[in-house]
């Protein structure tokens, strides 16, 4: 399986909410013998490898933000710790895996990484990650709502989390 980032860059005004999304695709076994572990963290663009450094998102570690579920299930973080920090991660039936950040500030700007570990019981494990940039802007040059720029050369899209 692989992880695709739907958008490589999100540009948002301060105070807005945004949902960053990764999508798991490829030969995903939806049986009971597969478990997915998924999480988010902040990082920096290394010279060789993006996402190798793991930094907290609003003081929450990748352990705090992780989800785990079977191949056929959806999941989300409903615990108070994440919500108190204005964060929620979620995973749906279609392979979309997201983190929603509320009330953005300039300090939220940076590189965000999603990590997915697929555990095929009695067989193997495999891990992949994806990366995207978040730019939070203020002042007259800031957009009125979040704009997401696709990973490929398509048109940008206005997106704002509810």
């Amino acid at each position: 399986f692989k992880v695709a980032t739907l958008y490589s860059l999100y540009v948002c005004p301060e105070g807005q909410n945004v949902t960053l999304t990764c999508r798991v695709f490829g030969p995903v076994d939806k049986g009971h013998d597969v478990t997915f572990y998924k999480t988010w963290y902040r990082s920096s663009r290394g010279e060789v490898q993006t996402c190798s450094e793991r930094r907290p998102i609003r003081n929450l570690t990748f352990q705090d933000l992780h989800l785990h579920h079977g191949g056929h299930q959806a999941a989300n973080t409903s615990h108070d710790l994440a919500q108190r920090h204005g964060l929620e991660s979620a995973s749906d039936h279609h392979g979309n895996f997201s983190i929603t950040m509320r009330n953005l500030t300039l300090l939220d700007s940076g590189l965000y990484c999603c990590l997915v570990v697929e555990i095929r019981h009695h067989h193997s494990e495999h891990r992949v990650h994806g990366a995207m940039e978040l730019q939070v802007q203020t002042g007259k040059d800031a957009p009125s709502s979040c704009v997401a720029y696709p990973s490929s050369s398509q048109e940008s899209e206005n997106i704002t989390a509810a």
Partner: antibody, heavy 120, light 106 residues
Framework: QLQLQESGPGLVKPSETLSLTCIVS??????????WGWIRQPPGKGLEWIGS???????HYNPSLKSRVTIPVDTSKNQFSLKLSSVTAADSAVYYC????????????WGQGTLVTVSS | DIQMTQSPSSLSASVGDRVTITCQAS??????LTWYQQKPGNAPKLLIY???NLETGVPSRFSGSGSGTDFTFTINSLQPEDVATYFC????????FGGGTKVEIK
């Protein structure tokens, strides 16, 4: 602080079954984010991963040992075990139990190891 | 399974020297590689994960780099307490270890 402690006989006869137990303290073996595994090291040689058990009871085994290995877990006693059947002298080694964090990847906590000799 | 080839198998260097160990994977493992230090009679100790991340409490003279199939572990200024055997291990798939490098002081 998490601690792992191996226990079991130091001498096993050829063709018999090697049985070791790892007692975990300072943390729950039922935590969903971890594998609990066994690694061995023949005297003066390198490390060989034997297998791991997931909190749910599912297992991963080294393909080269798969036919001889089982790793049971007893969550009520907060411990897991290693059973290696039909042992030979080549199975003589220091056996370590260890924890792997699923999200981080490496083995981050290890027991101190126990030497098992296979000899008649 | 993924094979890990570590070299050299042993080395001898002087205190203060820069020491380099390499590890090569038989297929692309992204950056899912860790380095351990094992002193005689002890269990291995985690030093570096994700190829370049230093575990908390590990001295900064230790570093790691690499991606894909080729990885390097460096001790910037060898100290007497660094005498040990060092192992790499991949965790892109089921864990496999390199053969180890024994580091001694000249």
């Amino acid at each position: 602080q998490l601690q792992l402690q191996e226990s079991g006989p130091g001498l096993v006869k050829p063709s018999e079954t090697l049985s070791l137990t790892c007692i975990v303290s300072g943390g729950s073996i039922s935590s969903s984010g971890y594998y609990w595994g066994w690694i061995r090291q023949p005297p003066g040689k390198g490390l060989e991963w034997i297998g791991s058990i997931f909190y749910s009871g599912n297992t991963h085994y080294n393909p080269s040992l798969k036919s001889r290995v089982t790793i049971p877990v007893d969550t009520s006693k907060n411990q897991f075990s290693l059973k290696l059947s039909s042992v030979t002298a080549a199975d003589s080694a220091v056996y370590y139990c260890a924890r792997r964090d699923i999200l981080t990847g490496p083995f981050d906590y290890w027991g101190q190891g126990t030497l098992v000799t296979v000899s008649s | 399974d993924i094979q890990m080839t570590q070299s050299p198998s042993s080395l001898s260097a002087s205190v203060g020297d820069r020491v380099t160990i390499t590890c090569q994977a038989s297929q692309d493992i992204t950056n899912y590689l860790t380095w351990y230090q094992q002193k005689p009679g002890n269990a291995p100790k985690l030093l570096i994960y994700d190829a370049s991340n230093l575990e908390t409490g590990v001295p900064s003279r230790f570093s790691g780099s690499g991606s894909g199939t080729d990885f390097t572990f460096t001790i910037n200024s060898l100290q007497p307490e660094d005498v040990a055997t060092y192992f790499c291990q991949q965790y892109d798939n089921l864990p496999t270890f390199g053969g180890g490098t024994k580091v001694e002081i000249k």
